[in-house]
Structures are given as structure tokens and as C-alpha cells.
């Protein structure tokens, strides 16, 4: 058993049929010595008396808010949560496996630039009685500071019969140099509590590996005289690291109709303009990627050909 | 600790081309190592990230773009003195700071060159003959060093009398390649910045 926060404790249980469970001793936070009784949750049934209560925690029915009273007055609470371990593996029931970029990916993180700011998000089908708390650091043995905000519900989607909820959090490394060469990864730890179930999820990454620029901005077309070719120009996104001559991007320019199966014109360039062939009912799209370290491409910025 | 804006004339920067070749060569070599050594811990997640130039050179700090010198987190640099002549300095107006930066890059390359050559000598003794260093990568390191044209003492190639542990050598190769790729990215960014300035 360990303390998650004040008056909230996590009991780690090997979860299998007829498991013996864990013996837990609760102590009432009071100078009083006698006349103390214990109850669980909203029940008025007295579970025991005395300053300490010893319980055998085997299942979710044994978890919850234990309260010690004296003469009708509440003295203190202890909330017990369960953390299940099945076949040596901690449960991951609360969050959905996003399976990208690999299986068992519960947390996904992205950074728009090298400033040390990044966003992580996760998915769940659970809508109520759900709380998250996020901690982060650079390295684990001698951790350097990363400050994370509160996790918030950022999107709701319908997936078949189920609703899916996306939560996200923004974090900022306390003293980040955009030009630094990372040797210690960022660690992100998410504590998830659903009702009386506790789970924790972690992710470890270098900022350089989670870079995904914003799409290029200010796309403009200029038809070339006596030609079917069009000059398309754009600018670096405002959120990208500066100076741009140091933090350079490379671009992919594509002309395609509405369907992905349609034929297309595609060209890669390090410049902020390119010449492509425009077709009726097609769109010109441009996306960006770090020129020197190939992490993710940005989303597409698009303009219609006509 | 920073690069000034007044640097060589546009298009007069012979090192840019060589640095692009360097990044390409080390990326290809790393990809080859990952494929060939698929049953070894050779991915970014699996290896320890070591920097053989740590406390010996200060490339990131010495080559910091002027715009980032206002960022206090970028300024915890180690002061190191370097030789200040080089043929990539295509303008006489080039400052002492830029010479410091380019000479730091030269020292990086020299250190990695020695490590890679020592390692290759060991890998050539491996009866499995599983992986060797790409001669192209070694040549590209040499070309960039020549373009930088700094005079410095030759670092002797390390020779070892004991029987090499090939498993450890291959893991060390992965660690070195990952670190060198990261440094090659920095070098490419620096050369691009200098070329544009």
C-alpha cells in the first residue's frame, strides 16, 4: 500500500481467483484513543472499533472511503483504491490502446517546435467518475523539471455504438534550449482513477522524436503564363522554432482530387514555393517536416486549384 | 558562445554541401545497423544515449544562433579554447566566435573518426563478419574535416591488446551512430544558418 495523495491510498493486488489479497491497517488521524468506530462509504454498518482498523483487501467491495467517527463526529477519512496486477502485468482497463505507432500505446505526445512545450493525449470510453493527474520530468534518476497543466476533456467522438473521449494535457520543460541535443528522455506519468480503480500509464520520449510542425501558412497560387503549371508559395508556420535558417523545414507539395485513389502530382522541396500542374476539381496541398531530423509530417494545408 | 549574423557571402560556404553528405551518410549507416543488428538493442529507445564529446567540445553552445543567445537555458556553456583558422571561413570578416564554432565541429569529427576507425578494426576481426562501417561515411567525415581545414594534433588510433567482445562492440557502434547522427543534425543546422546569414 502507498499514498497517492493526502488520505488516498493505493492497494496493489495480485488479481486471480481466490487470491489472498492484502492486509491493510488503517489508522485514524486523531489524538483520541477510545470510542472510535469505522464505517465504509455511505453505509452505517460499523466495521470495527479502535484507533486502527485491520482489513483484508481482496476485491473492489473492500475498497472505498473508510471513515472513523467518535460520537457522531467524523474524525478522518482514508480512501482505498485498487491497482490490479494480472499475470504480473498491471491492468490497463481505463485507457484505450491507440496502437500507433505500436501496440500498447496509451499516451501519445506531440510538440509543434523545439521550445520544450508538448501536448499528450489519451482515449477512454469511460464518461463518469474519472480523474487524471499528470507528472513529467526530464530523466528519471536525477529528474529535471517539467510543468504540466490539468488534463482536460478535449474531444468526444462516436465510434460505432461507443462514445470515445479524448483527454489532453500541455506540459512545458522548465528550462529548455531549442538547440540542445537531448540525451535524457522526457518521462510522462499519468495517474488514472475510475471509481475505485487506480492505474498508471507512462511514456518516454525525446522532444526531437515527437516533433510535428503545424501546417504551412498563407498558401498562394500564381498561374504561369502559357502553361498548365501553377506556382504555389507558402510560409513557415508561426509556431515553428526560429531562426528558420537553423530550424529548417522541408515540404511536400501535392495536387490531388477529392479521392485518395485519384492521380496526383507530387514534388518535394526545401524552398517555400514550387511549380505543379493544377487540374480542375483538384486541390493543392502542402505539408512540412523538419529538414534534418525526420519526425512526423505536419497536417496538410490546402487550397483549391480553381 | 554564439554565431554572429555577419558571416560569409551567400553561396561561399563549401561546408554546407559536406555537412549534408555527412548527415545522409550517418543516417544510412544507422539504418543499416538497425537492420543488420535487429536482434541487438540498437533502436533509440533501447540504447543509452552517450556523447563522447561531452566536456571535450562545446559545439551546441559555440554554434548557437544569435537569436537564441537571449535564451538563458542555452547559455550554460563550457568555455573551451580552440584554434581559429579554417577554409570554410570564406570571409575575412568572420568572427572569432564563428571560428570557435567551426573548430569545435572539427574536434567532434576528429573524435568520432578515431572511435569509428578503432571500432571498424575490431569489427573486421569478427568471424561472423556481420557489420562494418560504411567507407562512404568515413570518407565524408574526412572530406568535411578537410573543408574545415583546422590544424590540430593527430589523435592516435586506440589499439587494444585484449580479445574484442563483438557483442559489446556492436552495441557500442549503435550508441556511437545514434549520438553521431544527433551531432550531424546540429552540424547541418549550423552550416545552413551560416550559409543563410
Amino acid at each position: 500500500i502507498w499514498e497517492l495523495k493526502k488520505d488516498v491510498y493505493v492497494v496493489e493486488l495480485d488479481w486471480y481467483p481466490d487470491a489472498p489479497g492484502e492486509m491493510v491497517v488503517l489508522t485514524c488521524d486523531t489524538p483520541e484513543e477510545d470510542g472510535i468506530t469505522w464505517t465504509l462509504d455511505q453505509s452505517s454498518e460499523v466495521l470495527g472499533s479502535g484507533k486502527t482498523l485491520t482489513i483484508q483487501v481482496k476485491e473492489f467491495g473492500d475498497a472505498g472511503q473508510y471513515t472513523c467517527h467518535k460520537g457522531g463526529e467524523v474524525l478522518s477519512h482514508s480512501l482505498l483504491l485498487l491497482h490490479k496486477k494480472e499475470d504480473g502485468i498491471w491492468s490497463t482497463d481505463i485507457l484505450k490502446d491507440q496502437k500507433e505507432p505500436k501496440n500498447k500505446t496509451f499516451l501519445r505526445c506531440e510538440a509543434k517546435n523545439y521550445s520544450g512545450r508538448f501536448t499528450c493525449w489519451w482515449l477512454t470510453t469511460i464518461s463518469t467518475d474519472l480523474t487524471f493527474s499528470v507528472k513529467s520530468s526530464r530523466g528519471s534518476s536525477d529528474p529535471q523539471g517539467v510543468t504540466c497543466g490539468a488534463a482536460t476533456l478535449s474531444a468526444e467522438r462516436v465510434r460505432g455504438d461507443n462514445k470515445e473521449y479524448e483527454y489532453s494535457v500541455e506540459c512545458q520543460e522548465d528550462s529548455a534550449c531549442p538547440a540542445a541535443e537531448e540525451s535524457l528522455p522526457i518521462e510522462v506519468m499519468v495517474d488514472a482513477v475510475h471509481k475505485l480503480k487506480y492505474e498508471n500509464y507512462t511514456s518516454s520520449f525525446f522532444i526531437r522524436d515527437i516533433i510535428k510542425p503545424d501546417p504551412p501558412k498563407n498558401l498562394q497560387l500564381k498561374p504561369l503564363k502559357n502553361s498548365r503549371q501553377v506556382e504555389v508559395s507558402w510560409e513557415y508556420p508561426d509556431t515553428w522554432s526560429t531562426p528558420h535558417s537553423y530550424f529548417s523545414l522541408t515540404f511536400c507539395v501535392q495536387v490531388q482530387g477529392k479521392s485518395k485513389r485519384e492521380k496526383k502530382d507530387r514534388v518535394f522541396t526545401d524552398k517555400t514555393s514550387a511549380t505543379v500542374i493544377c487540374r480542375k476539381n483538384a486541390s493543392i496541398s502542402v505539408r512540412a517536416q523538419d529538414r534534418y531530423y525526420s519526425s512526423s509530417w505536419s497536417e496538410w494545408a490546402s487550397v483549391p486549384c480553381s | 558562445r554564439n554565431l554572429p549574423v555577419a558571416t560569409p557571402d551567400p553561396g561561399m560556404f563549401p561546408c554546407l554541401h559536406h555537412s549534408q553528405n555527412l548527415l545522409r551518410a550517418v543516417s544510412n549507416m544507422l539504418q543499416k545497423a538497425r537492420q543488420t543488428l535487429e536482434f541487438y538493442p540498437c533502436t533509440s529507445e533501447e540504447i543509452d544515449h552517450e556523447d563522447i564529446t561531452k566536456d571535450k567540445t562545446s559545439t551546441v553552445e559555440a554554434c548557437l544562433p544569435l537569436e537564441l543567445t537571449k535564451n538563458e537555458s542555452c547559455l550554460n556553456s563550457r568555455e573551451t579554447s580552440f584554434i581559429t583558422n579554417g577554409s570554410c571561413l570564406a570571409s575575412r570578416k568572420t568572427s572569432f566566435m564563428m571560428a570557435l564554432c567551426l573548430s569545435s565541429i572539427y574536434e567532434d569529427l576528429k573524435m568520432y573518426q578515431v572511435e569509428f576507425k578503432t571500432m571498424n578494426a575490431k569489427l573486421l576481426m569478427d568471424p561472423k563478419r556481420q557489420i562494418f562501417l560504411d567507407q562512404n561515411m568515413l570518407a565524408v567525415i574526412d572530406e568535411l574535416m578537410q573543408a574545415l581545414n583546422f590544424n590540430s594534433e593527430t589523435v592516435p588510433q586506440k589499439s587494444s591488446l585484449e580479445e574484442p567482445d563483438f557483442y559489446k562492440t556492436k552495441i557500442k557502434l549503435c550508441i556511437l551512430l545514434h549520438a553521431f547522427r544527433i551531432r550531424a543534425v546540429t552540424i547541418d543546422r549550423v552550416m545552413s544558418y551560416l550559409n543563410a546569414s
Partner: antibody, heavy 118, light 107 residues
Framework: QVQLVQSGAEVKKPGASVKVSCKAS????????LHWVRQAPGQGLEWMGW????????EYAPKFQGRVTMTTDTSTSTAYMELRSLRSDDTAVYYC???????????WGQGTMVTVSS | EIVMTQSPATLSVSPGERATLSCRAS??????LHWYQQKPGQAPRLLIY???QSISGIPARFFGSGSGTEFTLTISSLQSEDFAVYYC?????????FGGGTKVEIK
């Protein structure tokens, strides 16, 4: 699968014209760009131009501008390349090729040998 | 127009050995570079597109790399069926242009 079958070999006199055909099967002609590339005996490859069968748009290499015409007949799934004012150095194998991407060549025809000789 | 230069013109290699073919562009073409293989009496066949992207059905021993002005096609271990002429082609701008080819022959 996608296939391109070209017309047979031709022998032409200098100053004449030649029209090479290229019949597509295994796909809808309008779904792909169509290019023509030639190869003189023992020489390398030379791009001549492309046509978009969907709308008839064409782009020719400057070297062939004014001397080449590329057309398609969607009813027969056939593309044509006509080269006029033939010279002896136009002797080559002419290939048609198709791709969903405009700028490189995925599916090639078997080639048509055109000999220009007096 | 962009001029593509391939080297060497002829490469003599023993089966099982590694072959490295070079292609240089007269100006920067990013990764807009494609490789083809042509055997005598046959049409060319696409091997690699956009400098390093593999084509399904093409053996993994064919490996493309490079960007800007310098590109390489590496055949890690030459098989008898790999002896052929290899062409690079740029798609950065029209007119599309090919290199002069590298003939890979048996040593």
C-alpha cells in the same frame, strides 16, 4: 493487372510522320497520366511529354515542342503519340508508360521500334 | 533543364558483392529522384521512387539514399539477375530528365 500494349515496329523516311499507339488494359485510361519516353539504340532514356487522358492536357519537352502531338481515345482506351518531320536521329524505341503519379514512370509498354532511314 | 550525371558509366562487380551507383543533379532537387533497371531488350522497371521509397515486389537488397544533388543506389549483394543498366530520373521540374545510365556487369 495494369498493362500497356504498343503498336508494331515502323520504318519511315526522313520528313515523314509516325503515329504510335498504346492500348491500356486492367484499368480505366483516365485514372492514370500517360507519358512517352524514347531510347535511341545503345543510348539512354529521353522523356518526350505527358498527357492527362481525363481532359487532354499535355506537357511536352521543349525539344519536341511543335513536332509532337499526344492524344487519347477513351472509348478504345488507347493513347497515341505522333511525331512529325522525322530525322534519322529520331530512330529509337518509343515507350508509353502510365502512373497515378505525374512525375515518374511505373507501368511501361513493351516499346515500339521506329526506324527513320532514306 | 536539370542535367543528371551518373557514375561510373560501367561497374564491374562479382556476384554477392555490393554495388554502389551514383547520380548527381546539376542543381538541388530535394528527394525528387527515381531509379530504374533495364535489361537488354526489355522496358525499364521502376526500382525506387523519391530517392529511398521501396516498390513492393522489388528485393530489399536495392537501397536508395540521398537528397539535394547527390544520390546513391546500393545493391547490397548482387545476384545474377541484377546485371543490367540502371538509370536515375529527376522529377523536380519539367522537362523530366534521366541520367546517362550505369551498366553493372559481371566481373
Amino acid at each position: 493487372q495494369v498493362q500497356l500494349v504498343q503498336s508494331g515496329a515502323e520504318v519511315k523516311k526522313p520528313g515523314a510522320s509516325v503515329k504510335v499507339s498504346c492500348k491500356a488494359s486492367g484499368y480505366t485510361l483516365t485514372d492514370y497520366y500517360l507519358h512517352w519516353v524514347r531510347q535511341a539504340p545503345g543510348q539512354g532514356l529521353e522523356w518526350m511529354g505527358w498527357i492527362d487522358p481525363e481532359n487532354g492536357d499535355t506537357e511536352y519537352a521543349p525539344k519536341f515542342q511543335g513536332r509532337v502531338t499526344m492524344t487519347t481515345d477513351t472509348s478504345t482506351s488507347t493513347a497515341y503519340m505522333e511525331l512529325r518531320s522525322l530525322r534519322s536521329d529520331d530512330t529509337a524505341v518509343y515507350y508509353c508508360n502510365a502512373n497515378k503519379e505525374l512525375r515518374y514512370f511505373d507501368v511501361w509498354g513493351q516499346g515500339t521500334m521506329v526506324t527513320v532511314s532514306s | 533543364e536539370i542535367v543528371m550525371t551518373q557514375s561510373p558509366a560501367t561497374l564491374s562487380v562479382s556476384p554477392g558483392e555490393r554495388a554502389t551507383l551514383s547520380c548527381r543533379a546539376s542543381q538541388s532537387i530535394s528527394i525528387n529522384l527515381h531509379w530504374y533497371q533495364q535489361k537488354p531488350g526489355q522496358a525499364p522497371r521502376l526500382l525506387i521512387y523519391f530517392a529511398s521509397q521501396s516498390i513492393s515486389g522489388i528485393p530489399a537488397r536495392f537501397f536508395g539514399s540521398g537528397s539535394g544533388t547527390e544520390f546513391t543506389l546500393t545493391i547490397s549483394s548482387l545476384q545474377s539477375e541484377d546485371f543490367a543498366v540502371y538509370y536515375c530520373q529527376q522529377s523536380n521540374s519539367f522537362p523530366l530528365t534521366f541520367g546517362g545510365g550505369t551498366k553493372v556487369e559481371i566481373k
